[in-house]
Structures are given as C-alpha cells and as structure tokens.
Interface confidence: medium
C-alpha cells in the first residue's frame, strides 16, 4: 500500500519533554526478554509500549503506562484528575462484546455503542476484553454517564470483525504498517469526534481490493487503503472528502458501506 | 480426530511477507466453540505465541504486541483453513512456525510445524 | 504481559524417578494453566489442561497442582519416553504466555 506523500508526517514537535531521557529512543537492551515496558516517543508526544529484553536499555523505560506519562508528559496529572472526574469515556468502551474463549456462564454488563447504554452479556470467564462490567452501575458510571462525552450518534454499524479487542492502542495502522503520527495535530485521547473515527483502517475479510479512506486521529488526515469488499469498520469512506467531512468536523454522518454478509 | 497441516515457503528474504497456512480435517474454522493460533519457537525465544481467531456468531482476534503491527490472521472458510501473514520480516523471525487448536486457551492439536528462514 | 518462570531450567533424573517441575506466574492466573511437553523435531503436545486435567491418553503418572501463581507437573514414576522439554502456559490474560521450558535428561 503506496501512502501519499503528504499523509505521512513526521517531523520532530517542539514540545518539551520535563527530562532529557525522555528524548532517547527506546532501547531493549542486548538480552533476549521479552518484557513489556513503556517509553516516551519524542515524535508522537505519547507514551508507547515496546517490549525490552531484560538488561542495559535506558532510562527512557517505564513498567507502567501512568508511570511514563507522569514522568514525561508535561501537566499530564492535571488532566488525569480531569479525565478521572468523568470528562472523557475511555476507548475500551467502544470495544465489541468478547465473550472470551472459556465456557463458564457469567452475568456481566458491557457498554453498547449502538444503543448508547450498558447492557448484560454473558461472559465465558476467560480472555475477552475491557468492555466487560461486574455490576451495571461500574458499567454506567465508566461508560455511559461521562460528564463531557461525545454527543450521541445514531447511524453506527457495528464491524462484523472484531479486531484486536483486548486492546486499544494509540498507534494507528494501515493494513498492519504502522503510520507515522505527526506532533501538531490533537492526541488520541483529545479527540472529541465520532467513536468510529478512532478505528483502526481494517481491510475486512474478502478477496475485492477497493479504494477507501480512512482517519487517522493521531495525523488528522485521512490515509487511502484497500479494503477487501466486506467485514471491516466503520472508519470506511469511499471518498477523502466524505472521510474529513464526517471526521475532521462530523458535518455528515457515516454512510454504509453495503457490507456484504 | 482433528488435524491441521501446515503449508508455506520455509525461505523468506528481510523486508518481504512471511504466509503460512494451516488446513484443518475434522472440525470446523467457524465452530463457535474452537479457537485457532499461531505460536512460533526459537531457540533465542522459545514458545511464542503471536495471536488466535475465534468466531463466536462473530469473528474476533487478538494478537500479541511484540507482532502486533505486522500481523494478520485470517479465516477462510471456504477451504477450511487459516491464514497467518508477519509482514516486513527480519532475520529474528527465523523460527519453527506451529497453528494449533484450542477450545480456550488450552491448545490441544497441533500443526507439524514449519520451519521459515529469514534470509537473503 | 504475564511472566511465566519454570524451575528448574533443566534436570537429571533416572528411570523410576519422581520428577518436579514448578511454574511461577508473575500474576495470579487462578487456574488458567496448561503443561505441554514436547520431544525434538516434534510439535508440543498437550499434558495438562486447567492445572490438574489430565489430556485423554496422557499416563496417569503424570499430575498437576497449584492455584494462583504457583504451579506443580509431577511425574511419579519417570518412563525412558519421558525424557523430554516440559512448558507451562497460562492463558489468564492476553498474551498467551510460556514458560521457558525445563528439559529433563537421563541421569
């Protein structure tokens, strides 16, 4: 997959990190771990994971995501008390229901984005994914009530294939190639557009090759990829213009793609 | 009994697509109680697991972060297999290469095994 | 990810022996753990399923024990087919994990 020029923007932002070694690149050391740790990304301004062998390395490492951010993200524990107080719903709200893998039956509630409420499910005991609730009310205080949410939206198509649902990263891919994210556009975590703008570009499972666009939230701009003719995401526009349109100022809403089942 | 055979190259050159392919005999890719993965082993890392599709009236995957940006699991139900595709590979992708089935995490059937070489 | 950390790394042990393997979860996995043992040139094959599940057809000499992170393959009575490299994974959270793996030699 060719990306235009102009897609991929990367050059150093001016922001300042609070320590020097938050500027060092990530470095897994000589040894042969595999450690999950965190580290500063000068480029994208966020914390990331990389994973790290064991020993050497530098300081530019972090066992915890919060740990990372505290240390190098300017204000970052201003905002973490606003985000905790309810301005923000977190990503793993927007993940599909995961039964898991096991076969236990357990009542659990998870937060759904069609109806825009948290609802029962049943979970097998095992695996799944963060959108998974002991009791409504954790559910709706996480999930459904957050004090400054996105505004509702009512034409969402939920994906036929669910991608990755442990885990919601702040990197974005294009059929599995990792896209540069440029500094000077809003985080991730910024973002206060529609849920399915976030998505990763997902190719879908059949055999077409299709011209689409899709946002990346991380560089503001819509990135061409192929998609496959069904399955996929909603973070699917046949055009770019319909694709900054609906995500860059939500003036349209998502069209379906005729997904074929 | 269920069986899986794997099939793909055992010879892949840095910066190019490793694919590999697990046939299954006796269940089904979309039987809503098995799981399908993908492990590899090396002598450097030993049993790694990379990621699984499940289907469960829908299909889902996950996949491990250290690969996570260069992996796709695919189902294809048509022939009654799985697909796995680790884009832009490097020598440290040389292992012996295993699918296997499991009903949860328990992976009880296994492929032969495909060694892949990563090498120009 | 959840660390998995066998004990010992390798051993010597001779026919008739009783043999013990510990596996150390770096977080509790309650009883989401499984042994496999594998023999060179040959795939793992599944022992043990949930810590103390015996898989059909596997000896009963062969038994788990554990809960929470730590973790026990006993073979009572070791067999010249025995001799092999033993792995525990837990499958409490994503990623699946290993252990390193203990290989067990004739004395």
């Known amino acids: 997959l060719s990306e235009e020029a102009d897609d991929t923007d990367s050059e150093l932002g001016s922001m300042k990190p609070l320590h020097t070694f938050c500027a060092m690149k990530a470095d897994d050391g000589p040894c042969k771990a595999m450690i999950r740790s965190y580290f500063f990304n000068m480029y994208t301004h966020q914390c990331e994971e990389f994973i790290y062998g064991g020993c050497e390395g530098n300081e530019n490492r972090f066992d915890t995501l919060e740990e990372c951010k505290k240390t190098c993200i300017p204000g970052y524990e201003k905002t973490a008390v606003k985000a905790a107080s309810g301005a923000e719903r977190p990503d793993f709200c927007f993940l599909e229901e995961d039964p898991g893998l096991c076969r236990g039956y357990m009542k659990r509630y998870l937060y759904n984005n069609q109806t825009k409420q948290c609802e029962r499910f049943v979970y097998g005991g095992c695996l799944g994914n963060r959108n998974n609730f002991e009791t409504l009310d954790e559910c709706k205080k996480i999930c459904e009530n957050p004090v400054h949410s996105p505004s509702p939206v009512n034409e969402v198509q939920m994906s036929d294939y669910v991608t990755d649902g442990n885990t919601v990263t702040d990197r974005s891919t294009v059929n599995n190639i990792v896209v540069p994210q440029s500094p000077k556009v809003p985080r991730r975590r910024d973002y206060r557009g529609r849920p399915w703008c976030l998505q990763p570009a997902d190719s879908g499972l059949c055999k077409a090759s299709e011209r689409r666009f899709y946002y990346n939230s991380a560089t503001g701009k819509c990135h061409r990829f192929n998609y496959t003719g069904c399955g996929g995401n909603n973070n699917n526009f046949t055009t770019r213009r319909r694709c900054l349109r609906s995500c860059k100022t939500g003036l349209i809403k998502n069209k379906s793609k005729g997904v074929v089942k | 009994q269920v069986q899986l055979q794997q099939s793909g190259p055992g010879l892949v050159k840095p910066s190019q697509t490793l694919s590999l392919t697990c046939a299954i005999s006796?269940?089904?890719?979309?039987?809503?109680?098995?799981?399908w993965s993908w492990i590899r082993q090396s002598p450097g890392r030993g049993l790694e697991w990379l990621g699984m599709?499940?289907?469960?009236?829908?299909?889902?995957?996950h996949y491990a972060v250290s690969v996570k940006s260069r992996i796709t699991i695919n189902p294809d139900t048509s022939k009654n297999q799985f697909s796995l595709q680790l884009n832009s590979v490097t020598p440290e992708d040389t292992a012996v290469y295993y699918c296997?089935?499991?009903?949860?995490?328990?992976?009880?059937?296994w492929g032969q095994g495909t060694l892949v070489t990563v090498s120009s | 990810d959840i660390q998995m950390t066998q004990s010992p790394s390798s051993l010597s042990a001779s026919v008739g022996d009783r043999v013990t393997i510990t596996c150390r979860a770096s977080?509790?996995?309650?009883?989401?753990l499984n042994w496999y043992q594998q023999k060179p040139g040959k795939a793992p094959k599944l022992l043990i399923y949930?810590?103390?599940n015996l898989q059909s057809g596997v000896p009963s000499r062969f038994s788990g024990s554990g809960s929470g992170t730590d973790f026990t393959l006993t073979i009572s009575s070791l067999q010249p087919e025995d001799f092999a490299v033993y792995y525990c994974?837990?499958?409490?959270?994503?990623?699946?994990?290993f252990g390193q793996g203990t290989k067990v030699e004739i004395k």
């Open positions: 977080q509790s996995i309650t009883n989401y």
């Open positions: 296997a089935r499991g009903g949860s995490g328990v992976m009880d059937v």
């Open positions: 006796g269940d089904s890719v979309s039987s809503s109680s098995a799981a």
């Open positions: 949930d810590v103390s």
């Open positions: 994974q837990q499958y409490s959270g994503y990623p699946l994990t």
């Open positions: 599709i499940y289907y469960r009236s829908k299909w889902y995957n």
